[in-house]
């Protein structure tokens, strides 16, 4: 049974030519995370294995950073990178946990972060 | 190129432990980032993924066989190990040791990439 | 554990035709799906990774393609040594799981 929940930062934005860390965190479950995939809008951004490391998707090497943890760092951000980001969890044994994120990236210095919020 | 080879007898009697050996060439286990996997076949079946471990000693099993397994690494040989206990005429298979994830960091996928050969158990008195 | 089912169990189609093979998740794999072949008293082989990328020396009448829980393996024109068992597998969620095998035959 999945009792887990998955913890995100929900609404957020950011400045055109700035960064943002994405995260997610999964609480109220033992279950073991063995990886992370990072997709945008079935785009994938970037994998995190447990065992076998980061994979950086090529065609966001140079956006896209690993970590901190197991979250994700988008660099010189676009007004195209504004959309919906999901954080896979992968674990055993429970199986698949998804949280999303949606990420507004403006063109003035007035981005604020939005608040949490959970996903089941 | 990685390759593998798995060793081990062809008979075994039931209620008894099944172990096989399999070893690795063309690369160190213990720098590879990589899952060593076991797979089995019974005779006209499909495949059945066993279980797997990670260099560091992390290990996967399938929960159906998850009370009877043991996968083991020995970095020093260049070789990992499966155990199965307790035998039955439905342990009979093709045994395949297996490389999974080997292009992980490159392109980002977790699959069997590089199979052994295989070798016949038959658990029979 | 995610349950794969592929379908049909055989298949039989004539050398130069186009083969297709289905395989379905019991929940979504997102595009983290793997198709092998095998041949009699062989190992599977890996032809295709990411529900749609080739592997490695895999000619390009292997085609793959589906997201989610549906996904199909196409063979656009069936050579004499494509006559073979082959599997879907998903992961990375542990317990990796198989499909049953669709056996393409000769018609």
């Known amino acids: 049974m999945m009792t887990g929940t998955i913890e995100t930062t929900g609404n957020i934005s950011a400045e055109k030519g700035g960064s943002i860390i994405l995260q997610c965190h999964l609480s109220s479950t033992t279950a073991q995370v063995t990886q992370v995939n990072w997709e945008q809008q079935d785009q994938l951004l970037a994998i995190c294995n447990a065992d076998l490391g980061w994979h950086i998707s090529p065609s966001f090497k140079d956006r896209v950073a690993p970590g901190p943890g197991l979250g994700l760092t988008l660099q010189s951000l676009t007004v195209n990178d504004t959309g919906e980001y999901f954080c896979i969890y992968h674990t055993y044994p429970d199986g698949t946990y998804t949280g999303r994120i949606f990420l507004e990236v403006l063109e003035s210095s007035v981005a604020e972060h939005g608040a949490r919020f959970q996903i089941p | 190129q990685l390759q593998l080879q798995e060793s081990g007898p062809g008979l075994v009697k039931p209620s008894e432990t099944l172990s096989l050996t399999c070893t690795v060439s063309?690369?160190?286990?213990?720098?590879?980032?990589?899952?060593l996997a076991w797979i089995r076949q019974p005779p006209g079946k499909g495949l059945e993924w066993i279980g797997s471990?990670?260099?560091?000693?992390?290990?996967y099993y399938n929960p159906s066989l998850e009370s009877r397994v043991t996968i083991s690494v020995d970095t020093s040989k260049n070789q990992f190990s499966l155990k199965l206990s307790s035998v039955t005429a439905a342990d009979t298979a093709v045994y395949y040791c297996a490389i999974e994830g080997a292009n992980f960091k490159d392109f980002g996928y977790v699959a069997f990439d590089i199979w052994g050969q295989g070798t016949t158990v038959t658990v029979s008195s | 554990e995610i349950v794969m089912t592929q379908s049909p169990a055989t298949l039989s189609v004539s050398p130069g035709e186009r083969a297709t093979l289905s395989c379905r998740a019991s929940?979504?794999?997102?595009?983290?799906l793997a198709w092998y072949q095998q041949k009699p008293g062989q190992a599977p082989r890996l032809l295709i990774y990411g529900a749609s990328t080739r592997a490695t020396g895999i000619p390009a009448r292997f085609s793959g393609s589906g997201s989610g829980t549906e996904f199909t393996l196409t063979i656009s024109s069936l050579q004499s040594e494509d006559f073979a068992v082959y599997y879907c597998q998903q992961s990375p969620p542990w317990p990796r799981t198989f499909g049953g095998g669709t056996k393409v035959e000769i018609k």
């Open positions: 063309g690369g160190s286990i213990s720098s590879g980032s990589y899952y």
């Open positions: 471990i990670f260099r560091s000693g992390s290990t």
């Open positions: 929940q979504s794999v997102s595009s983290n």
